[in-house]
Every structure is written in C-alpha cells, then in structure tokens.
Interface confidence: low
C-alpha cells in the first residue's frame, strides 16, 4: 500500500518531519477547499475583511468573540483555518446557527415567537460533541436573581399544552452591563436531529424577581447582535489508521 | 404512577436542626422539567412553601424569608429528596410536604403548581 | 414576594348551591410572553395533603369534576363550585407560581348550610 509505506517513510524520518508532512497535506488540503469555494462564488480572490467588520456583523457574544481574536492570531501567524486536528485525525468544527422564521413560531398566541432554528446537515445527531444555546441577559438595575427556562414548543396536545421543559437555571444578576448565558442542549439537538419534525422551536423565558423579563429574544433598538444563537461544535473521526 | 413520601422526626428540640427525607417511588423523575418542593403547614393554617429543586440539574431555590436555615439536597440514585432546616424554633412545628409537578414539562414553567403530594411528616419543636 | 390575599374565610352553602371563593394577588401572575395566569387552587380536607384542582386559573387537572371551575387574570381570581356535593366539604387554597417565592392564600372553609 502506497499510503501507509509513504507513512512509515516519515515517522522513520522523526517527529518533526512528520509534523511538517501533515501540516503540508492538510494546508493543501485546505486550500484546495478554499478554491473550490471561491470558484462557487465566482470570485478570483478571497473578499478582504476585516475584523471590525466581522465584529460588526456577528452576535457580540463570547464564543464568536473568541473565533475571530483566534483567526485574527491565526492570520498573524500565517496559520490555517478554524478547525481543530489531534492524533486521530479528528477534526471539530464550531457551527454558529441563528435563528430564523418558523410558521408554527408565528402561530402561537398570534405574536411571533423566539427561536426556530434551522440546521446545517453537517450537524448530523451522532457527530454533535457540544451544543450550547446562548441568550442575551439585558442589565438590571438593582442585583437580582433570575430565573431562566428555555422551554421546547410540541404540537398542541388535547389540552392546549404547547410546551415541553428544557432547561432551566438559577443566576445572580448585579447592577451594570448585561450577560451571554449559554445553556446545554445538546440533548435537545441530537432528538431533534433524529426527529426534525419535532423541531418546532423553543421559547425563552427569563424573569427577574419583579417578574420583568430579561432575555433580548427579538432586538430591540441598541441591540443588534444580541439575539439568541446555537453554537454547536461537531466532530468527524474517521478510523484511526494502523502503523 | 410516581408517589412520595416523606420521613423524618416526629419531635425535635428548639435549636436542632431537623432533616426530612422525601422518596420518590413508581417513576422516575430523570426526564428534564422534574421539580420537587417542600411546604409546610402549621397545625389549623395556611400552607407556605419553603424550597424547590429541579430533579436533573443543580437548580435550588429557598423562600427568601427561610433561605439561612434552608438546604435542601438530592441523591438521584436513591430517588430522595433531602430537606434540612436549622435552629428549629416552636413556631415551626407544621406538617411538612414534598409536593412535585408530575410532567410539568407539559404544563408550563417551574412547577408551577403541585399535583403529586406526599402524605406529609408532622414535627413537634418542644423542649 | 406576591401575598395571596382570599376572602371569605368561611363560607356555608347549600347541597346543590353555587359556591364562589376569590383569590387577590398583590401583584399580577400574569406572564404576558405565554399569555398565562400561574395561578392554581386546591382543595384540602382534614387530615389529608392539598389535592390540585385548577392551574393557569382555568384549566381543569385531569380528574377533577367540572363542578369546578376557575376564572380571572392578572391579579383576581374565582374558584366556582357549580352545584355543592356533601364532599367538597374542605379548605380552598389558591397558590400563584408565577414568581418565587411561591405563595399560598389563607384558606376558605366550605361548609353546608
């Protein structure tokens, strides 16, 4: 087998050889990637933007945050790409999933509710390794306990019930700006993966002691960027090759 | 069809600390939105419910009013509830109840309201 | 903390009479994001724990007779016993589980007349 004596070949040139070969294949593996998108977008050259932009453009929450300080490093460093790679050639990946519109949503007490969300097939019920939903607190003015529940809508049963629990949290607020709070759901995910069409969408409740309710689930003026969002981070492993 | 029952000592003295064990049984209570509640009742009054925990996340919250003399814990292997309340005065002798919202995923948010009650445990606080 | 205020504290009614007990909260147990009231009655004979018979205000717990029925919104509600049966002989307790802490009424005493 051409491949596997290719690999024998490195490892008995040493560590660093090997590093570099994976790190020559997997960067012209990437950039063939990046050919073929820009040919589907029928562009000669990668747009040119910068940060701000992005920062401008994206949820100002924490993980998004973290993805571009890491790829304006990246960048720097004249490194590659937004996935991760260990020993078993496992790549991860981090899909950012927004809201969007869903009719069933739109129906439920004739006002529009938060959040439906549609899903990439990448994301695939047995490849998601973490899924966080992450909603934004808006500040309170005296310190306060609030009470978060993110409840999964179901079709109406004889009863009229519409919702089924999630998950629910307990938190301390104090006075200042407000919070990302991000909850698991991965649970949630994987059935909804298994079963799209119980993907009707979640509502999101989130009440201060006074009963007011803190979650920016439809932005208001002054917060673009702050609606609720999926972050879900998938892997795929592919059997591990033997030596 | 889930039942609970709660246990602990018919009498305790003023200052102790009283602990009252409520213990699911029939069902299980592992499926997201499981809420169980302690509320007590003086003899002849009113009800007053004292704390919550959500049954497969670490949620808890007391009466704001009781909350320095309030813990309450579980242990998810032995399907129990644990309540435990310091320096016990006269005025708590009541009848305590564990009360739980059966499929309170389908009814709305929190637990809010209790169709599942253990028969309840009287305590005397007496010297 | 909302303080559930029921009146009257005893009321006689005879068999086959309607029976009204109401309910105030000091503040609103409405949650206008799911449109509900997080209000639910009980009934409690001696002896025995609280048995749930209304919650949202209005909707019925499975097995309860429709004699019973609640109504109201916001911060004022009923519970109405249609037609009064020689077992509904007990204490009516409304309780709001809309914000912590969760707070029970007094009580009303329903008797026969």
């Known amino acids: 087998n051409e491949n596997s004596e290719q690999k024998e070949n490195v490892e008995k040139e040493g560590l660093c050889n090997a590093c570099t070969w994976r790190q020559n294949t997997k960067s012209s593996r990437i950039e063939a990637i990046k050919i073929q998108i820009l040919s589907k977008l029928r562009l000669e050259t990668a747009p040119n933007i910068s940060k701000d932009v992005i920062r401008q453009l994206l949820p100002k929450a924490p993980p998004l945050r973290e993805l571009i300080d890491q790829y304006d490093v990246q960048r720097d460093d004249s490194s590659d790409g937004s996935l991760e790679d260990d020993d078993y050639h496992a790549t991860t990946e981090t899909i950012i999933t927004m809201p969007t519109e869903s009719d069933f949503l739109m129906q439920v007490d004739g006002k529009p509710k938060c959040c439906f969300f549609k899903f990439s097939s990448k994301i695939q019920y047995n490849k998601v390794v973490k899924a966080q939903l992450w909603i934004y607190l808006r500040p309170v003015e005296t310190p306060t306990t609030v009470f978060v529940q993110i409840l999964r809508l179901i079709k109406p049963m004889k009863d009229g019930t519409r919702y089924t629990g999630i998950r629910s949290l307990k938190l301390d607020m104090n006075p200042g700006t407000g919070i990302w709070q991000s909850i698991d759901v991965k649970t949630v995910l994987q059935n909804w993966l298994k079963q799209p069409e119980s993907n009707l969408g979640i509502e999101i409740k989130a009440l201060d002691e006074n009963g007011h309710d803190l979650a920016v689930t439809f932005p208001g003026p002054g917060e673009d960027g702050l609606n609720p969002f999926l972050e879900v981070k998938v892997t795929d492993t592919p059997k591990r090759s033997r030596r | 069809q889930v039942t609970l029952r709660e246990s602990g000592p018919a009498l305790v003295k003023p200052t102790q600390t009283l602990t009252l064990t409520c213990t699911v049984s029939?069902?299980?209570?592992?499926?997201?939105?499981?809420?169980v509640n302690w509320i007590r009742q003086p003899p002849g009054k009113a009800l007053e419910w004292l704390a919550m925990?959500?049954?497969?996340?670490?949620?808890?919250v007391y009466n704001s009013a009781l909350k320095s003399r309030l813990t309450i814990s579980k242990d998810t292997s032995k399907n129990q509830v644990v309540l435990t309340m310091t320096n016990m005065d006269p005025v708590d002798t009541a009848t305590y109840y564990c009360?739980?919202?059966?499929?309170?995923?389908?009814?709305?948010?929190?637990?809010?309201?209790?169709?599942?009650w253990g028969q309840g445990t009287m305590v005397t606080v007496s010297s | 903390d909302i303080v559930m205020t029921q009146s009257p504290d005893s009321l006689a009614v005879s068999l086959g009479e309607r029976a009204t007990i109401n309910c105030k909260s000091s503040q609103s147990v409405l949650y206008s994001a799911d449109n509900k009231n997080y209000l639910a009655w009980y009934q409690q004979k001696p002896g025995q724990p609280p048995k749930l018979l209304i919650y949202?205000?209005?909707s019925l717990e499975n097995g309860v007779p429709d004699r019973f029925s609640g109504s109201g919104s916001g911060t004022d509600f009923t519970l109405t016993i249609s037609s009064l049966q020689a077992e509904d002989v007990a204490v009516y307790y409304c309780q709001q589980g809309h914000l912590f802490p969760y707070s029970f009424g007094g009580g009303t005493k329903v008797e026969i007349k």
């Open positions: 949202d205000a209005s």
């Open positions: 029939g069902g299980s209570l592992s499926s997201g939105g499981s809420y």
């Open positions: 009360a739980h919202r059966q499929n309170v995923d389908s009814y709305g948010y929190w637990g809010d309201a209790f169709d599942i």
């Open positions: 925990t959500d049954w497969d996340a670490d949620n808890i």
